[in-house]
Interface confidence: low
């Protein structure tokens, strides 16, 4: 029996379409596939950012694949051809690997890139990113922010910069249509007459950086002689009630501090008739069903009760 062999794919390359980290990996079929005309060959593709411990691996019949990468680091990828079992009498036949790399030649020293980049998606409506200028850069240095997510034809530049001392230190984004639950890519580059400025790349998903508004309309309701129900309403905005978790801080008579994390807009508190004063505040966060992460809102305005009225049915501010 002659050993069945197959060549690796040809012209394997990583192409940067200018989407700030979303790259195309593409290749051509191997040479001398004439023997396997009846077979649809497959390709096993492995890729990672240089320095990462783990490879991502996919098997595809296509001649291209797309994914997001961290352009602050290089990218390495390798691919080989796999012949399906029905073409090889059940034996596993694969080619040698074809390998390629890609990186953006860095300009400037690392200290010149922006520092402390921070992006918050306020109330799932308004994205704001802020940063500090690089270490030791001169006032003539200016930074520019570009962004892209799937659905945009090309990367867009920020049109509403936040400035300090004439330098861009942040960006207020416009309405971002259909931009959540997908990777959001940002590049902040810079220019200076004196020295080159290092670019920085960031990737996140908007639903994971949401900071909601605080809850509103805090009220007390007497449930029984020893129970008081604390209630509040979800903040105004597009976030549905099912997406919230809440944290409550309750202070009784300036001594006992109770904290609790709850899922609904109510909390029942055990009290005694001796309670003279009750105060509580609530904050909100997007929960595990709607995001993988999130930022707590600010605390709500404090709602307090003082005096005899605790024995009455409903207690409002």
């Amino acid at each position: 029996d002659t050993e069945i062999k197959v060549n690796p794919p040809q012209d394997f390359e990583i192409v940067d379409p200018g989407y700030l980290g979303y790259l195309y990996l593409q290749w051509q079929p191997p040479l001398s596939l004439d023997h396997f005309k009846e077979c649809t060959v497959e390709y096993e593709l492995k890729y990672r950012n240089i320095g990462s411990e783990t490879w991502k691996t996919i098997i595809t019949k296509n001649l291209h694949y797309k994914d997001g990468f961290d352009l602050n680091k290089g990218i390495e990828a390798k691919i080989h051809t796999l012949l399906p079992w029905q073409c090889t009498n059940g034996s596993e036949v694969q080619s040698s690997w074809a390998e390629t790399t890609y990186w953006i030649s860095p300009q400037g020293i690392p200290e010149t890139k922006v520092q402390d980049m921070d992006c918050v998606y306020y109330n799932w409506q308004y994205l704001l990113c802020s940063w500090k200028p690089g270490i030791g850069v001169l006032l003539d240095t200016n930074y520019n922010l570009f962004y892209w997510y799937e659905g945009l034809d090309h990367a867009l530049q920020c049109v509403d910069y936040i400035k300090a001392d004439g330098q861009n230190i942040g960006c207020r984004f416009p309405y971002l249509e259909a931009s959540d639950y997908k990777d959001f890519y940002i590049c902040v580059n810079g220019s200076s007459e004196n020295k080159p400025i290092r670019s920085s790349y960031f990737t996140f998903q908007l639903q994971n950086i949401v900071k909601p508004l605080p809850p509103v309309y805090l009220t007390f309701t007497r449930e029984s002689s020893c129970e008081i129900k604390l209630k509040w309403s979800i903040p105004l905005g597009p976030i549905p009630a099912r997406c919230f978790d809440y944290e409550i801080e309750i202070r009784e008579d300036d001594t006992t501090l109770v904290t609790a994390t709850v899922e609904n807009e109510t909390y029942t508190l055990k009290t005694t008739n001796e309670t003279r004063q009750l105060c509580f505040v609530v904050r909100s966060k997007v929960n595990i069903y709607c995001s993988d992460d999130g930022i707590w809102s600010e605390w709500s305005d404090k709602q307090c009760w003082e005096g005899e009225d605790l024995s009455k049915k409903t207690l409002l501010r």
Epitope: R242, D245, T261, V262, E263, N287, I288, Y289, D292, D293, G294
Partner: antibody
Framework: QVQLVQSGAEVAKPGASVKVSCKAS????????TQWIRQAPGQGLEGIGA????????SYNQKFKGRATLTADKSTSTVYMQLSSLRSEDTAVYYC????????????WGQGTLVTVSS | DIQMTQSPSSLSTSVGDRVTITCKAS??????VAWYQQKPGKSPKLLIY???YRYTGVPDRFSGSGSGTDFTFTISSLQPEDFATYSC?????????FGGGTKLEIK
């Protein structure tokens, strides 16, 4: 993406202890509860306890109080579950899982660690 | 602790069948019930939470209903990949407790 990667299978003798690790990635480790759940062969799932790495708060199933100890190492984003005074009925697959609050189900699970208690 | 009693413990069924599994809580758990799918040697996978909400990416053939103490999980048309064990869990109080599981087997 969120990942929980557990340590490998363990064999222990009755009366001994075992320590299983669960390394988290892809989210803010200190912001979410990590729950430990076990499954004996052919049996249902059973909660052991949970830890909140942000402040090392723990919540134990009464059945495991005193025998299970949950700890978290923020520097490595790793949670540990130590079970002592092992007996044969502790033979099970032990899972770590991520919730948000204590009263949430678990969308993210580790791959499981088989602990076999045998003399 | 709240007990979750699941039935049946096993079910022989065929591709295309409608499958219904029930879970009964030992006390009122409002709508705080989740359902998981588990295949041999694999971790459980969350399908339904809060009795009737499908988790992200779960096909709409899976559904859940119920409140109080009685809960139902339904697969409207069984697919080959659905043969697995399904478990309910109450997420109303600590500790979380699970039903004993229902194993779907090919008839």
């Amino acid at each position: 993406q969120v990942q929980l990667v557990q340590s490998g299978a363990e064999v222990a003798k009755p009366g001994a202890s075992v320590k299983v690790s669960c390394k988290a990635s892809g989210y803010t480790f200190t912001s979410y509860w990590t729950q430990w759940i076990r499954q004996a062969p052919g049996q249902g799932l059973e909660g052991i306890g949970a830890i909140y790495p942000g402040d090392d708060d723990t919540s134990y199933n009464q059945k495991f109080k005193g025998r299970a100890t949950l700890t978290a190492d923020k520097s490595t984003s790793t949670v540990y579950m130590q079970l002592s005074s092992l007996r044969s009925e502790d033979t099970a697959v032990y899972y770590c899982a991520r919730g948000a609050t204590l009263l949430r189900p678990f969308p993210y699970w580790g791959q499981g660690t088989l602990v076999t208690v045998s003399s | 602790d709240i007990q979750m009693t699941q039935s049946p413990s096993s079910l022989s069924t065929s591709v295309g069948d409608r499958v219904t599994i029930t879970c009964k809580a030992s006390q009122d758990v409002s709508t705080a019930v989740a359902w998981y799918q588990q295949k041999p040697g694999k971790s459980p996978k969350l399908l339904i939470y809060s009795a009737s909400y499908r988790y992200t990416g779960v096909p709409d053939r899976f559904s859940g209903s119920g409140s109080g103490t009685d809960f139902t999980f339904t697969i409207s048309s069984l697919q080959p990949e659905d043969f697995a064990t399904y478990s309910c869990q109450q997420h109303y109080s600590i500790p979380p407790t699970f039903g004993g599981g229902t194993k779907l087997e090919i008839k």
